[in-house]
């Protein structure tokens, strides 16, 4: 014969366990209520009565079914470096993220504990490897035939101009100079393509890879008055 | 956590070839992130960088003038080390000679965050 | 070569006390600046990277700043395991350089 539906509290069967949304109390040594999402155990259940449950106070919340004596605190505010995706409520934490140009460098539980900048890459070299919500930029030199002249944390390495004339050959940090005729890329005819004025900070030598199991000799030649600033040349 | 440990002898005689290794943990010498460093210092003149090995889909290779033309930084993937070979040495070039890990070549945010012990090398007859 | 010139090359202060480092280099590195600690027997320790930001572990007593040409490394409220050499670095241009050092001993 089916037993009766027990309402709260009641003794479970020897061996048995308490229903969902119910915890056994070692006390009262019965089965009792657990409190809902946003609200947690202001009086403990006994033989004859069940839990009292009540509202979250401000800046606390409780995210599961429990019987917690008090809610849990929220996280302290965002830092300038965080935006906020998940407000402080009764029932949910705040999560911090990092804002756009940051990455997370320490995470926690939920959302990030550190928010680092995400690193840019100097003129010569682009990134070979985006940033993620938990990664830093990689950068990579320009390979010969490319140019990067920004300092971004975005940018990879663009392929030069290729010129019918060339006033000034590329290098790993400036695009080509193009002369007479006009250039591949759409340009006006007969113009002169000067490219953007970029400061000789961080420009290197045409990076040549040196063989995978043993990099050949690569020198650092000064060019001008300056040496080149990440040379990276090989065999 | 990143270590360094740095093998090499302490004494090389003036013309010989100076060659030290740094082996790896806790980092790849063929990490797409990280490049591998050669500096030494001496009383007569102070921290001195000498060179780096580094791979971004191919090997780089980076080494200071002062030294162009006796320096090799070979990477070894089998045994996830580095090597330094100076040729020709002199008495100039005694110094403690360290390897460090670089991270962020090319970009901003660049430095030497972990150092091996060092190792005092002496160029003597 | 950028040349970094730091000075004092060194200077003596007591536990409590504040103290300023600078370094100049011979051409305008932007914001490309490294300060490092060294103490006796063993290898530089980084601090402070790009000039002005403290690296992850090392207390906030520590700070930088500058731009240029022109920086500044600062120690607040020294504490006895402060006392060490201390090195500037650039990275805008290889080769990658340092200052000659700064010797901060106790008086």
């Known amino acids: 014969e089916p037993r009766a539906v027990a309402f709260t509290p009641y003794a479970p069967e020897p061996g048995g366990t308490c229903r969902l949304r119910e915890y056994y109390d070692q006390t009262a040594q019965m089965c009792c209520s657990k409190c809902p999402p946003g609200q947690h155990a202001k009086v403990f259940c006994t033989k004859t009565s069940d839990t009292v449950c009540d509202s979250c106070e401000d800046s606390t919340y409780t995210q599961l079914w429990n019987w917690v004596p008090e809610c849990l605190s929220c996280g302290s505010r965002c830092s300038s470096d965080q935006v906020e995706t998940q407000a402080c409520t009764r029932e949910q934490n705040r999560i911090c993220t990092c804002r756009p140009g940051w990455y997370c460098a320490l995470s926690k539980q939920e959302g990030c504990r550190l928010c680092a900048q995400l690193r840019k890459c100097r003129p010569g070299f682009g990134v070979a490897r985006p940033g993620t919500e938990t990664s830093d930029v990689v950068c990579k030199p320009c390979a010969p035939g490319t140019f990067s002249n920004t300092t971004s944390s975005t940018d990879i390495c663009r392929p030069h101009q290729i010129c019918h004339v060339v006033a000034i050959p590329g290098n790993a940090s400036m695009d080509a100079v193009c002369t007479s005729t006009s250039p591949t890329r759409s340009m006006a005819p007969g113009a002169v393509h000067l490219p953007q004025p970029v400061s000789t900070r961080s420009q290197h030598t045409q990076p040549t890879p040196a063989p995978s199991t043993a990099p050949g000799t690569s020198f650092l030649l000064p060019v001008g008055p300056s040496p080149p600033a990440e040379g990276s040349t090989g065999d | 956590q990143v270590q360094l440990q740095q093998s090499g002898p302490g004494l090389v005689k003036p013309s010989q070839t100076l060659s030290l290794t740094c082996a790896i943990s806790?980092?790849?010498?063929?990490?797409?992130?990280?490049?591998w460093n050669w500096i030494r210092q001496s009383p007569s003149r102070g921290l001195e960088w000498l060179g780096r090995?580094?791979?971004?889909?191919?090997?780089?290779?980076d080494y200071t003038v002062s030294v162009k033309s006796r320096i090799t930084i070979n990477p070894d993937t089998s045994k996830n080390q580095f090597s330094l070979q100076l040729n020709s040495v002199t008495p100039e070039d005694t110094a403690v000679y360290y390897c460090?890990?670089?991270?962020?070549?090319?970009?901003?945010?660049?430095?030497?965050?972990?150092w091996g012990q060092g190792t005092l090398v002496t160029v003597s007859s | 070569d950028i040349q970094m010139t730091q000075s004092p090359s060194s200077l003596s202060a007591s536990v409590g006390d504040r103290v300023t480092i600078t370094c100049q280099a011979s051409?305008?590195?932007?914001?490309?600046l490294n300060w490092y600690q060294q103490k006796p027997g063993k290898a530089p320790k980084l601090l402070i990277y790009?000039?002005?930001n403290l690296e992850t572990g090392v207390p906030s007593r520590f700070s930088g700043s500058g731009s240029g040409t022109d920086f500044t490394f600062t120690i607040n409220s020294l504490q006895p395991e402060d006392f060490a050499t201390y090195f500037c670095?650039?990275?805008?241009?290889?080769?990658?350089?340092f200052g000659q050092g700064t010797r901060l001993e106790i008086k």
């Open positions: 460090a890990r670089e991270d962020g070549v090319g970009g901003t945010k660049d430095y030497f965050d972990y």
């Open positions: 806790g980092d790849s010498v063929s990490s797409d992130s990280s490049a």
């Open positions: 090995t580094y791979y971004r889909s191919k090997w780089y290779n």
């Open positions: 051409q305008d590195i932007s914001n490309y």
């Open positions: 790009d000039a002005s």
């Open positions: 670095q650039q990275y805008d241009n290889l080769p990658i350089t």
